[in-house]
Amino acid sequence: QDSPPQILVHPQDQLFQGPGPARMSCQASGQPPPTIRWLLNGQPLSMVPPDPHHLLPDGTLLLLQPPARGHAHDGQALSTDLGVYTCEASNRLGTAVSRGARLSVAVLREDFQIQPRDMVAVVGEQFTLECGPPWGHPEPTVSWWKDGKPLALQPGRHTVSGGSLLMARAEKSDEGTYMCVATNSAGHRESRAARVSIQEPQDYTEPVELLAVRIQLENVTLLNPDPAEGPKPRPAVWLSWKVSGPAAPAQSYTALFRTQTAPGGQGAPWAEELLAGWQSAELGGLHWGQDYEFKVRPSSGRARGPDSNVLLLRLPEKVPSAPPQEVTLKPGNGTVFVSWVPPPAENHNGIIRGYQVWSLGNTSLPPANWTVVGEQTQLEIATHMPGSYCVQVAAVTGAGAGEPSRPVCLLLEQAMERATQEPSEHGPWTLEQLRATLKR
């Protein structure tokens, strides 16, 4: 007896894992036996080469290679989602449509959210190594390796939760190098190696001892730049401190530093940097032309001692290490307008107090320079005759004028009817382009 089609086996969501083909199953009942056709994102598949899909007699769809992907809202969908497949079974009595099945590609990105850190634990006490794996599809699993071998998890002593390794009771044998490994069908990624040291318990209680530690920050000195770091390195300082109090020293010292705000203003938040030293250490990554406050804090494990006194240091201004950007020349009525954008903030090296503008010789302007004070980023120059006008601009801090911009030129033609600044749509004229044009 004739009957309309019914889907018996629906296609299932799956990952495309080359090199072999992906298979999407679809089985249907009905009399006469229904014909199967497949749709991708609602569009029928042609099955004609170069279409990578192939239909088997039993209705199974073979996907020989990932189909070309259309536009997606975001890179994540574009990198993982191959689309939704549905099958249709039809005979003269009707058509049945299956559930949609999503085909996706396995992905495992490289950046860990949290990397395990070196640490010191005490025998008999609990410690945790944190790990946040990279984004992956499907979601990666995390395993832990110790000294280059998979860690044998002991129930009751080891727990892996949300990527982190919890050790209930530290033993001397737990000392070693730990690594977190994220794995999914796309492959695996290894975290940095974290060194775990295990100490014997002390007779004293750490936090109480730390509270008795006194740190005297004695000196903050500006270091001479290392020539190996290039011509314009960021400033670094050398911190020196003295520790007094109990015999047991702190395990580590942290520098706290911030830029000083105007008197009465709310202080900036303190930035923290672990120091590689016990009585003195270098602290880098500062900015020229800023007033800084510094202090040092002792710590041992999770316990923190009291902060040291605060010392102030004014880092001198340097000349700006980049020129003003987007320098343009525009004709006015008997004038030319010069305008520019300040150098990037990271190149200010202090407070920009103004700008120096030079006109270049051998042009219609005699060699001259102008000083623009304050935050103004434009200048009007009087012009008395047609010809070429070329300028350079440099930002000025308390240390002087910085790197000048490339020369930018403007060609004012007879009677100033027309001004040319852009040879064939390539931006402002350079001095070289202008000379070539004048020669022609």
Epitope: D74, G75, A77, D111, Q115, P134, W135, H137
Partner: antibody, heavy 118, light 112 residues
Framework: EVQLVESGGGLVQPGGSLRLSCAAS????????MSWVRQAPGKGLEWVAT????????YYPDSVKGRFTISRDNAKNTLYLQMNSLRAEDTAVYYC???????????WGQGTLVTVSS | DIVMTQSPLSLPVTLGEPASISCRSS???????????LNWYLQKPGQSPQLLIY???NRFSGVPDRFSGSGSGTDFTLKISRVEAEDVGVYYC?????????FGPGTKVDIK
């Protein structure tokens, strides 16, 4: 069209609890990590929690760690934030947002206001 | 934790003129793989934040090309080549290189 709709905000006493929900539609919820971000009245934005697409991995700042729990139900396309031991400084508009990988928050809900006051 | 600072905190601008906002981090935002996760958001008055720039310099879909991002390490800049009336609001930078993720304090942009 991607849509995120937060609910569950309201007035709660210090020390109390509240559970926020975020209903997601217009995208395959189960393949995206999600986050909560809050904004105290007249203040800036503060990241509160992130959860991986399968719910295995969660991340919090110290200010809420141990008090707030982010979770998700992929079958219901819903993100949750369970907030316990609430304090006056938790008063804020809470936004849920979709994450692309763990790189950036691309779509945000309209927010739900949580007021902690006696 | 990484501290993000922005300058200026308030920026009165003239329509049609350029504008620039700086964002600095207390540590480098470049991770061990050489990737930098610094994003810019605009929160218009009474609205939720909206993404402008991701991973330092990539414009999000639908964001006008007058917005551009640049920078590396600890120093980043958002530029608007010609400010329009719809650009007013508070601009935030956000770093997601290191957990906990941290926002800058915001820069309020309004028309002079």
């Amino acid at each position: 069209e991607v849509q995120l709709v937060e609910s569950g905000g309201g007035l709660v006493q210090p020390g109390g609890s509240l559970r926020l929900s975020c209903a997601a539609s217009g995208f395959t919820f189960s393949t995206y990590a999600m986050s909560w971000v809050r904004q105290a009245p007249g203040k800036g934005l503060e990241w509160v929690a992130t959860i991986s697409q399968g719910g295995t991995y969660t991340y919090y700042p110290d200010s809420v760690k141990g008090r707030f729990t982010i979770s998700r139900d992929n079958a219901k396309n819903t993100l949750y934030l369970q907030m316990n031991s609430l304090r006056a400084e938790d008063t804020a508009v809470y936004y849920c947002a979709r994450l692309i990988y763990y790189d950036y928050l691309d779509y945000w809900g309209q927010g739900t206001l949580v007021t902690v006051s006696s | 934790d990484i501290v993000m600072t922005q300058s200026p905190l308030s920026l009165p601008v003239t329509l049609g003129e350029p504008a620039s906002i700086s964002c600095r981090s207390s540590q480098s935002l470049e991770n061990s793989n050489g990737n930098t996760y610094l994003n810019w958001y605009l929160q218009k008055p009474g609205q939720s934040p909206q993404l402008l720039i991701y991973r330092v310099s990539n414009r999000f879909s639908g964001v006008p090309d007058r917005f551009s991002g640049s920078g590396s390490g600890t120093d980043f800049t958002l530029k608007i080549s010609r400010v329009e009336a719809e650009d007013v609001g508070v601009y935030y930078c956000l770093q997601v290189t290191h957990v906990p993720w941290t926002f800058g304090p915001g820069t309020k942009v309004d028309i002079k």
